[in-house]
Amino acid sequence: IVKAGITIPRNPGCPNSEDKNFPRTVMVNLNIHNRNTNTNPKRSSDYYNRSTSPWNLHRNEDPERYPSVIWEAKCRHLGCINADGNVDYHMNSVPIQQEILVLRREPPHCPNSFRLEKILVSVGCTCVTPIVHHVA
Amino acid sequence: IVKAGITIPRNPGCPNSEDKNFPRTVMVNLNIHNRNTNTNPKRSSDYYNRSTSPWNLHRNEDPERYPSVIWEAKCRHLGCINADGNVDYHMNSVPIQQEILVLRREPPHCPNSFRLEKILVSVGCTCVTPIVHHVA
């Protein structure tokens, strides 16, 4: 996900940094700007129930992390749900995973000092054909 | 996703903050700590092709954002793929979306000053029944 080291023409109005480790340590404004004004997250919220690979959402809370609450998907079945509402064991429900960035308090319990951390979260599930290895 | 305002016992070794807006503006170390050492991201990399609701991945690049590269899923079909490899008109491929946090350079082009931003990304696709039949 992360591509670092891009050279950006510097804006003369940028804050100055006297940090010896600059640009490893940066200032971050935690007033979140939400770019999702046009989207309605409620609209896709029932997919977890209507999918052929349905999932449950589990709350993962960690006060040392920002955001402190993350929802993790766990597939309900190993197989997928067929048209009759039964589990089809010829197909597999699998989690779709994504690496996301979070802020980890460092040193621990510090309210204003963080380190960037990459974590893998399961966002939902999809139904896939299993890989069958044919023996010669 | 975000739950703020948790009271944390302060570590006496924390950096001092003289920022008037504290704790709105915090210090973040960009040396990413990767918690995913036990996982093999390659393992889920072919789900996009094997799913009954397959998707393509599109590169979204923005040098003013950190991470600058994010991959967006676009469902290949409107319907889902059946066992014969043909479309099933009775089922729909839909994107699974997740709100993630990114860092936006603010003011623009500044290498050491960011604002937290929430964006909605499509991570993959799942196959859903279009109509939920409500029983009276």
Epitope: R43 | H77, N92, P130
Partner: antibody, heavy 120, light 107 residues
Framework: EVQLVESGGGLVQPGGSLRLSCAAS????????MSWVRQAPGKGLELVAI????????FYPDSVKGRFTVSRDNSKNTLYLQMNSLRAEDTAVYYC?????????????WGQGTLVTVSS | DIQMTQSPSSLSASVGDRVTITCRAS??????LAWYQQKPGKAPNLLVS???SLESGVPSRFSGSGSGKDYTLTISSLQPEDFATYYC?????????FGGGTKVEIK
């Protein structure tokens, strides 16, 4: 230039049969979903049949299911609609239409239509 | 089947007017909506798909909006060639269904 040309319409008695054809040109026919849509005189549009790019998937609404059959011959760039057990309410202009994708969900090109009249 | 209700069924407007046509689905159709224009004796012509995506070659005075069950086609400044009948079509749940049409006439 994309062109769809329907033929085979005409007057038929109730209970009779008719086969419509749609000749496609100006695009790679075998990669597009196709549909038949009809319009009764002075009325709105109604889906009749859908077929995906290779003919492996089809769909019919209840109003024609069991009486109409959609097929395609990709080697001849032609779409067909076989209509059996025709009824007065099947009277309409029949359009063939192309989906911009593989499957047949919405329609970016339409033919000029062929009129089917079911009457005794 | 999903019912598509278009309103108004007809309207009279003048060249230069802003015209709005609405389409209501009986269930959420998740933005899977197309708009067509049909002139007398002609086949329909696709204007918009995915509720908001304008087809190439369609003038920018046409725009689609909406979500859930409610969708709108707007013509920002009506031109002489826009007098026609407009249909919406959902493609979320088979059978795909069309609205009853809105006839835009010259005032």
């Amino acid at each position: 230039e994309v062109q769809l040309v329907e033929s085979g319409g005409g007057l038929v008695q109730p209970g009779g049969s008719l086969r419509l054809s749609c000749a496609a040109s100006g695009f790679t026919f075998s990669t597009y979903g196709m549909s038949w849509v009809r319009q009764a005189p002075g009325k709105g549009l109604e889906l009749v049949a859908i077929i995906n790019h290779n003919g492996g998937s089809t769909f019919y609404p209840d109003s024609v299911k069991g009486r109409f059959t959609v097929s395609r011959d990709n080697s001849k760039n032609t779409l067909y609609l076989q209509m059996n057990s025709l009824r007065a309410e099947d009277t309409a202009v029949y359009y063939c239409a192309r989906d911009p994708r593989h499957d047949g969900y919405f329609f970016d090109y339409w033919g000029q239509g062929t009129l089917v009249t079911v009457s005794s | 089947d999903i019912q598509m209700t278009q309103s108004p069924s007809s309207l009279s407007a003048s060249v230069g007017d802003r015209v709005t046509i609405t389409c209501r689905a009986s269930e959420d159709i998740y933005d899977r909506l197309a708009w067509y224009q049909q002139k007398p004796g002609k086949a329909p012509n696709l204007l918009v798909s995915g509720a908001t995506s304008l087809e190439s070659g369609v003038p920018s005075r046409f725009s689609g909006s909406g979500s859930g069950k409610d969708y709108t086609l707007t013509i920002s400044s009506l031109q002489p060639e826009d007098f026609a009948t407009y249909y919406c079509q959902q493609y979320w749940s088979v059978p795909w269904t069309f609205g009853g049409g809105t006839k835009v006439e010259i005032k």
